[in-house]
Amino acid sequence: VPRWRQQWSGPGTTKRFPETVLARCVKYTEIHPEMRHVDCQSVWDAFKGAFISKHPCNITEEDYQPLMKLGTQTVPCNKILLWSRIKDLAHQFTQVQRDMFTLEDTLLGYLADDLTWCGEFNTSKINYQSCPDWRKDCSNNPVSVFWKTVSRRFAEAACDVVHVMLNGSRSKIFDKNSTFGSVEVHNLQPEKVQTLEAWVIHGGREDSRDLCQDPTIKELESIISKRNIQFSCKNIYRPDKFLQCVKNPEDSSCTSEI
């Protein structure tokens, strides 16, 4: 008789999750010489240990500490790019501008990007059927706590000028409930970070509005200023041209506003 299984509102663990994490780890450590010392089996063992046999609504940052320790990585603190609701463009940017880093360019971010996982309380099983949804079920689920933990650490490490890419096509360009708005903004260290520079990415070709004047951007400016960090904002009217100019800065068309 099959044992009763908790039904959650979110999708279940990603198919072949263990193999995906292990393979990503091997690939990352091969590409990044500074992480060659990392033993991927140990990293995966620590990852497993964070959520297996634990109630998927009762995960804590402490559960992820062994994984955080193994995945400790130094990125240039003045080359950090945060993003909110515009991941693909942020990643395209750091693929071209190789000296800048998003969270997903670090080992731990790379391992978990786009994956879902959860276990079951009192069984050592991975739940491939369903996992808790942040809104409908609980916020202290394995995926949300992971991203909260790594995002906090990433923001804490930042220094000098920190950039953030924001999606100008959304009704809330800056969303206080996003990971950026709820975690990263509050963990930038004023004694290390001089300026947060927002890049507001426009969606429509004919959109010439100054989205830096958007009420939610003003709200972000207020939060940042209260934390004794300077704030600046730039409109990126043509993201396609923006990327092209990052690739080829000498191009004559790259002197005009993008």
Partner: antibody, heavy 122, light 107 residues
Framework: EVQLVESGGGLVKPGGSLKLSCAAS????????MYWVRQTPEKRLEWVAI????????YYPDSVKGRFTISRDNAKNNLYLQMSSLKSEDTAMYYC???????????????WGAGTTVTVSS | DIVMTQSHKFMSTSVGDRVNITCKAS??????VAWYQQKPGQSPKLLIY???TRHAGVPDRFTGSGSGTDYALTISSVQAEDLALYYC?????????FGGGTKLEIK
């Protein structure tokens, strides 16, 4: 019936190579991490290789790293161990073993083959 | 590496006796311990995993226990067919390691 059958063992000179095979039947082979475990003449057990369910990930202890290669063919339900630069200390009974769980690497072995003997001697 | 020590290489017992086979880990392995039985001329067979979970089809006279660094396999009433080598193994951290084995002999 769940079964693992090893083959390919034999006598080989130091520095030589050998390829072991393991034919799996009676279960969904592609759902399981698989292992090679060896037993020395003194009866000590040591795992020598692991491969993930889809075959993308492999891992070895330092004692065989760079000399042994584990691979699998999920279409044929076969597991392999290519051994090269063999040493006298590789002399052992080699077992193909299945992971005890089908959702991740549990690292305990619930099905073992009968084994195939590898002797490295000049 | 975690060393798994089975201090008794041999144990002698009689049919019907209760026997305890012990295993000590060099560090805490968080109950991630498996036990195997290997009868003469055969391959090892899984008896117990996660220190106390009996594998399917294993007679209930076999019981696993322990936590931290100390683990035991208990056979409540030894049968003649239990003559075998018994191995513990930690499935906690890399590299996974086995104990040296305990040979159970029937008087």
């Amino acid at each position: 019936e769940v079964q693992l059958v090893e083959s390919g063992g034999g006598l080989v000179k130091p520095g030589g190579s050998l390829k072991l095979s393991c034919a799996a039947s009676g279960f969904t082979f592609s759902d399981y991490f698989m292992y090679w475990v060896r037993q020395t003449p003194e009866k000590r057990l040591e795992w020598v290789a692991i491969i993930s369910d889809g075959g993308i990930y492999t891992y070895y202890p330092d004692s065989v790293k760079g000399r042994f290669t584990i691979s699998r063919d999920n279409a044929k339900n076969n597991l392999y161990l290519q051994m090269s630069s063999l040493k006298s200390e590789d002399t052992a009974m080699y077992y193909c073993a299945r992971d005890g769980r089908d959702d991740y690497d549990g690292w305990y072995f619930d099905v073992w083959g009968a084994g195939t003997t590898v002797t490295v001697s000049s | 590496d975690i060393v798994m020590t089975q201090s008794h290489k041999f144990m002698s017992t009689s049919v019907g006796d209760r026997v305890n086979i012990t295993c000590k880990a060099s560090q805490d392995v968080n109950t991630a311990v498996a036990w195997y039985q290997q009868k003469p001329g055969q391959s090892p067979k899984l008896l117990i995993y996660w220190a106390s979970t009996r594998h399917a089809g294993v007679p209930d006279r076999f019981t696993g226990s322990g936590s931290g660094t100390d683990y035991a396999l208990t056979i409540s009433s030894v049968q003649a067919e239990d003559l075998a080598l018994y191995y513990c193994q930690q499935h906690y951290s890399t590299p996974r390691t086995f104990g040296g084995g305990t040979k159970l002999e029937i008087k």
